[in-house]
C-alpha cells in the first residue's frame, strides 16, 4: 500500500480544468524530494509530463503547472484545456525516478455532453444571476410564455407569463420583455445555486406552432485560491464580488465544523481572535473590497470565504469567492515579541522587522482602530511627519540595511495602550502586530533629567542633566533633538579611553547637554537614551523653553566657533580597573541624503536618517557630557 | 442549515451488495464535497474515511477512495436529488460498522474528518459471515 494519497478518479469534459492534489507523508525528505506526473502507457513505462524540477512535457506546453505545499505535505497538478486524449492513467508521486513512492489517478475527459442543436449554453458562478433569452414569433406574441427545468420524465415549470412560480423560484425568477421588441422575453434567475444547473426550455404558445428553445444552464463553485504565506506575516484577500452586490454588506469568514465563521463585516462585527490585526477596506463601486490580516499565526491556516449580504454572514445563493490559506512555520520574518509593555511616564522602543532587501523602503507605525471597518492611520514615517498629538514623545529611527527600524514612544499614558503596526511601502508580508500594554508606575523612572522645568535664557549658556542607574552604566548614552522629522542625536566626540571602576554609585551617573550660547532654535523637545549598538532602549523626554535676557541677568562670551560645534562625553573617573571606551556618534546627513551616501558612512548606519540637520550653521554647541563618579572599595 | 439523512443500511451476507443514499435537505444543498466515513463497533469516537467525493461543477469529479474499499465501493452523485450514494459490493465481515455520510464546502484532505461541515446520524451495516 502506497503512502502517497490522491483522487481514484477524476472525471471532467473537453475544454475544462482539472486541480489534482497529491498528498504525501510529513518527512523533511518528503518535503523536499522530486515531485512529479506521470502517465502510464501499455507497457507500464510511465512517462514524466511536468515535474517540480522544472520539466514540462511538450504536450502540456501552456496549460499545465505542479505547484508543491511542503508545509500542508501537499503537491497540486493543474491542467487546463483538457482534451480527450487527456484521457488516461497517471501517477502522482515522489523521488528521483518515476518508480518511487506513488499513487494511480484514472483521468476520464468526456465529450461535451450531446445537446440540442440549438442548445444555448449559459455558465455561471453560484450565487450570480441568469439571464435566459427566448426567442419567438410574432404570432406566439399574445401566448402565454413559460420557462421549465426539465427532469428525468417531464419539464418543471419554474414560471411562466401568468405569474406562476415554481416555490424554490420564488423572488429569484422574473419573467419580463424589454421595450417594444415583441419577438423576445427573457427570465432572470438570481442568486443561483447548484440545484438550478439543468437543462431548461423556454417556450411561447402551445401545441404543434409552439416557440421552444433549450437551454443549458452551468452552475460553477469557485475553486479555492491557494494562498501560501509565511508565520507571523500578512495576507490579503482580495475579493471581487461584482456589480450587484455593490450595496451590500461584505464579510470575510472561515470554514468551521458546521459553519462559515464570521472573521470580520462591514456591518462591524469582529472575531476577538483577530483584534488588533485585521481590516476591511471597501474598494470601490463595483463590490471590490479587500481583507488585510496581519501577524500570522499557525491557527490562522484553513479555508476562508468573502462574500456579500445585507446580513454581512454567509447565504446560500449569495456570491462567493474562496481561498485556502497554508501558513508556513518556516519563516523568513524574526520572531519579535508581539506585546510590548509600558508605564505611565516611560518610553517603549520597539523593533520593527522589515525585509532586508528593501532597506531603501519607506517606514511608517501606524495605530490600529478597530471602530468601523478599522483602519491604521500613519503616526510617524520616514518621510512621514508625526502626528501633532504625538509631538515630543514620538520617532522613528531607520536602521538602513539591517532589517530593523526602531519607533520610540515615551511620556506613555494608559491611552496609548492597543494595538501598532509596522509596514513598509515595499514587501507587504512583512507587515507585523505590536499590542502595547501600558501599566500605572509604581517606582520612579530609570531616567530623569533635571532640571525639570527648563527655561533657557537667550545668548546664555544653559546645561540639562540626565540622572541614569548603574544598569545603564555600560550602555551607550544620548542627548537627541526632537522634530516632527525624527529626533536626531546630537553630535559627540569620543575622549578616548577612560578607566572606571567596578563600584558604582548609583547617585552621580548622569550624561550633561549643554546649549550654549542658546539661540531661539533651540527651544523645543530633546531626549535622553541609552542603547547598545543598533538596540535602542529606554527614554525621557524634556521641553526646553527659550526666554529673551531680562535686565540684569549675566552676558556669556559666545565661545570660539569650533568649541561651539563639539559636544564631549565627559566622564569623571576615580580610581580603576575596568577600561570602558564610550562609542562615537557622528552627526547625522540632512532629511534628503540619499541611501547611498548614508549606507557609507558606516556606524553612522544607527542614526536616524529622517532626521533634521546635526549642528547650527552659526556655530552653536550642542554638548552632552557623562559623569561617572566611582568610588573603589 | 443543511441536513443529511442516510438509508440503505441493513444485514447483508459476505460478499452481497448494499447501497447507501444520503439525502441533503434543509437550506438548499451546495457543498461541493461529500463523503463517507465509518464507525466499526467498540471503536468509538474514530471515524475512518471510506469515500469522497469533491466536485468543482456539474462537470469535473474528484472521487477517493480508502484503501481498503478500493474496486468494492463506488461513490456518486445525483445532483437533481440531492442525493449522495455509496454502491458497496463484495462486502466482508471487517466492514461492519456504522456509516456516516459527510459535507462540505472544501476540504485540505477528504480523509480527515474534521474538515466536513455537516454529518449525518448514520446508518448500520452488518455483514454476515
Known amino acids: 500500500k502506497s503512502p502517497i494519497f490522491g483522487p481514484q478518479e477524476v472525471s471532467s469534459i473537453e475544454g475544462d480544468s482539472v486541480s489534482i492534489t497529491c498528498y504525501y507523508p510529513d518527512t523533511s525528505v518528503n518535503r523536499h524530494t522530486r515531485k512529479y506526473w506521470c502517465r502510464q502507457g501499455a507497457s507500464g513505462m510511465c512517462t514524466t509530463l511536468i515535474s517540480s524540477n522544472g520539466y514540462l512535457s511538450k504536450e502540456y506546453s501552456g496549460r499545465a503547472n505542479l505547484i508543491n505545499f511542503p508545509e500542508n505535505n501537499t503537491f497540486v497538478i493543474n491542467i487546463e484545456q483538457l482534451t480527450q486524449d487527456d484521457t488516461g492513467s497517471y501517477k502522482c508521486g515522489l523521488g528521483t525516478s518515476n518508480r518511487g513512492l506513488s499513487f494511480d489517478v484514472s483521468l476520464e475527459v468526456s465529450q461535451v455532453p450531446e445537446l440540442p442543436s440549438d442548445t444555448h449554453v449559459y455558465t455561471k458562478d453560484i450565487g450570480r444571476n441568469v439571464t435566459i433569452e427566448c426567442p419567438f414569433k410574432r404570432e406566439n406574441a399574445p401566448s402565454k410564455k413559460s420557462l421549465c427545468k426539465k427532469t428525468n420524465q417531464s419539464c418543471e415549470l419554474v414560471i411562466d407569463s401568468t405569474e406562476k412560480v415554481n416555490p424554490s423560484y420564488i423572488g429569484r425568477a422574473k419573467l419580463f420583455m424589454k421595450g417594444t421588441d415583441l419577438t423576445v422575453f427573457y427570465v432572470n434567475i438570481s442568486h443561483l445555486t447548484h440545484n438550478d444547473a439543468g437543462l431548461y426550455i423556454c417556450q411561447a404558445g402551445e401545441g404543434p406552432s409552439a416557440d421552444k428553445k433549450n437551454v443549458d444552464l452551468q452552475v460553477l463553485a469557485p475553486e479555492p485560491e491557494l494562498l501560501y504565506k509565511d508565520l507571523r506575516s500578512s495576507v490579503t484577500f482580495e475579493c471581487d464580488l461584482g456589480r450587484e452586490v455593490a450595496n451590500e454588506a461584505k464579510y470575510l469568514c472561515r470554514m468551521n465544523k458546521e459553519t462559515c465563521d464570521v472573521i470580520i463585516n462591514t456591518l462591524g462585527k469582529r472575531d476577538p481572535d483577530f483584534e488588533g490585526r485585521i481590516l476591511i477596506t471597501p474598494k470601490d463601486d463595483n463590490g471590490r473590497f479587500s481583507v488585510l490580516i496581519t501577524g500570522l499565526r499557525k491557527e490562522d491556516a484553513g479555508h476562508y470565504q468573502c462574500g456579500a449580504h445585507s446580513s454581512g454572514l454567509p447565504q446560500e445563493g449569495w456570491p462567493i469567492q474562496t481561498w485556502q490559506l497554508f501558513v508556513n512555520e518556516e519563516s523568513t520574518i524574526p520572531n519579535r515579541r508581539s506585546v510590548v509593555k509600558g508605564v505611565t511616564g516611560g518610553s517603549v522602543a520597539i523593533a520593527c522587522p522589515y525585509n532586508p532587501k528593501e532597506s531603501s523602503s519607506l517606514k511608517y507605525w501606524c495605530r490600529w482602530e478597530g471602530d468601523g471597518n478599522g483602519h491604521c492611520p500613519v503616526l510617524v514615517g520616514t518621510q512621514a511627519q508625526v502626528q501633532e498629538e504625538y509631538e515630543g514623545r514620538l520617532a522613528l529611527f531607520d536602521q538602513p540595511g539591517n532589517g530593523t527600524y526602531t519607533v520610540i514612544l515615551n511620556q506613555l499614558t494608559t491611552e496609548d495602550a492597543g494595538f501598532y503596526w509596522c509596514l513598509t511601502n515595499g514587501d507587504s508580508r512583512w507587515r507585523t502586530t505590536i499590542e502595547l500594554q501600558v501599566a500605572e508606575a509604581t517606582r520612579e523612572p530609570n531616567l530623569e533629567v533635571t532640571p525639570q522645568n527648563a527655561t533657557a535664557v537667550l545668548g546664555e549658556t544653559f546645561t540639562v542633566s540626565c540622572h541614569y542607574p548603574c544598569k545603564f552604566y555600560s550602555q551607550e548614552k544620548y542627548w537627541c533633538k526632537w522634530s516632527n522629522k525624527g529626533c536626531h542625536i546630537l553630535p559627540s566626540h569620543d575622549e578616548g579611553a577612560r578607566q572606571s571602576s567596578v563600584s558604582c554609585d548609583q547617585s552621580s551617573q548622569l550624561v550633561s547637554m549643554t546649549l550654549n550660547p542658546v539661540s531661539k532654535e533651540d527651544e523645543g523637545w530633546y531626549w535622553c537614551g541609552v542603547k547598545q549598538g543598533q538596540t535602542y532602549g529606554e527614554t525621557t523626554a524634556i521641553y526646553i523653553a527659550v526666554e529673551e535676557r531680562t535686565r540684569g541677568s549675566s552676558h556669556v562670551n559666545p565661545t570660539d566657533a569650533n568649541a561651539r560645534a563639539k559636544v564631549a562625553l565627559e566622564e569623571e573617573v576615580v580610581d580603576s580597573s575596568i577600561s570602558e571606551k564610550e562609542n562615537k556618534a557622528i552627526p547625522n546627513p540632512g532629511p534628503f541624503a540619499n541611501e547611498r551616501e548614508i549606507q557609507n558612512v558606516g556606524d553612522q548606519a544607527q542614526e536616524n536618517r529622517a532626521s533634521g540637520d546635526a549642528g547650527s550653521a552659526d556655530g552653536q554647541s550642542r554638548s552632552s557630557s557623562s559623569k561617572h563618579h566611582h568610588h573603589h572599595h | 442549515e443543511v441536513q443529511l439523512v442516510e438509508s440503505g443500511g441493513g444485514l447483508v451476507q459476505t460478499g452481497g451488495s448494499l447501497r447507501l443514499s444520503c439525502a441533503a435537505s434543509g437550506r438548499t444543498f451546495s457543498s461541493y464535497a461529500m463523503g463517507w466515513f465509518r464507525q466499526a463497533p467498540g471503536k468509538e469516537p474514530e471515524r475512518d474515511f471510506v469515500?469522497?467525493?469533491?466536485?468543482?461543477?456539474?462537470?469535473?469529479?474528484?472521487?477517493y477512495y480508502a484503501d481498503s474499499v478500493k474496486g468494492r465501493f463506488t461513490i456518486s452523485r445525483d445532483n437533481a436529488k440531492n442525493t449522495v450514494y455509496l454502491q458497496m459490493n463484495t462486502l466482508k465481515p471487517e466492514d461492519t460498522a456504522v456509516y456516516y455520510c459527510?459535507?462540505?464546502?472544501?476540504?485540505?484532505?477528504?480523509?480527515?474528518?474534521?474538515?466536513?461541515?455537516?454529518w449525518g446520524q448514520g446508518t448500520q451495516v452488518t455483514v454476515s459471515s
Open positions: 459527510a459535507g462540505g464546502n472544501y476540504f485540505s484532505d477528504p480523509r480527515v474528518d474534521k474538515e466536513y461541515n455537516y
Open positions: 469515500a469522497a467525493l469533491r466536485w468543482s461543477n456539474d462537470r469535473t469529479y474528484y472521487k
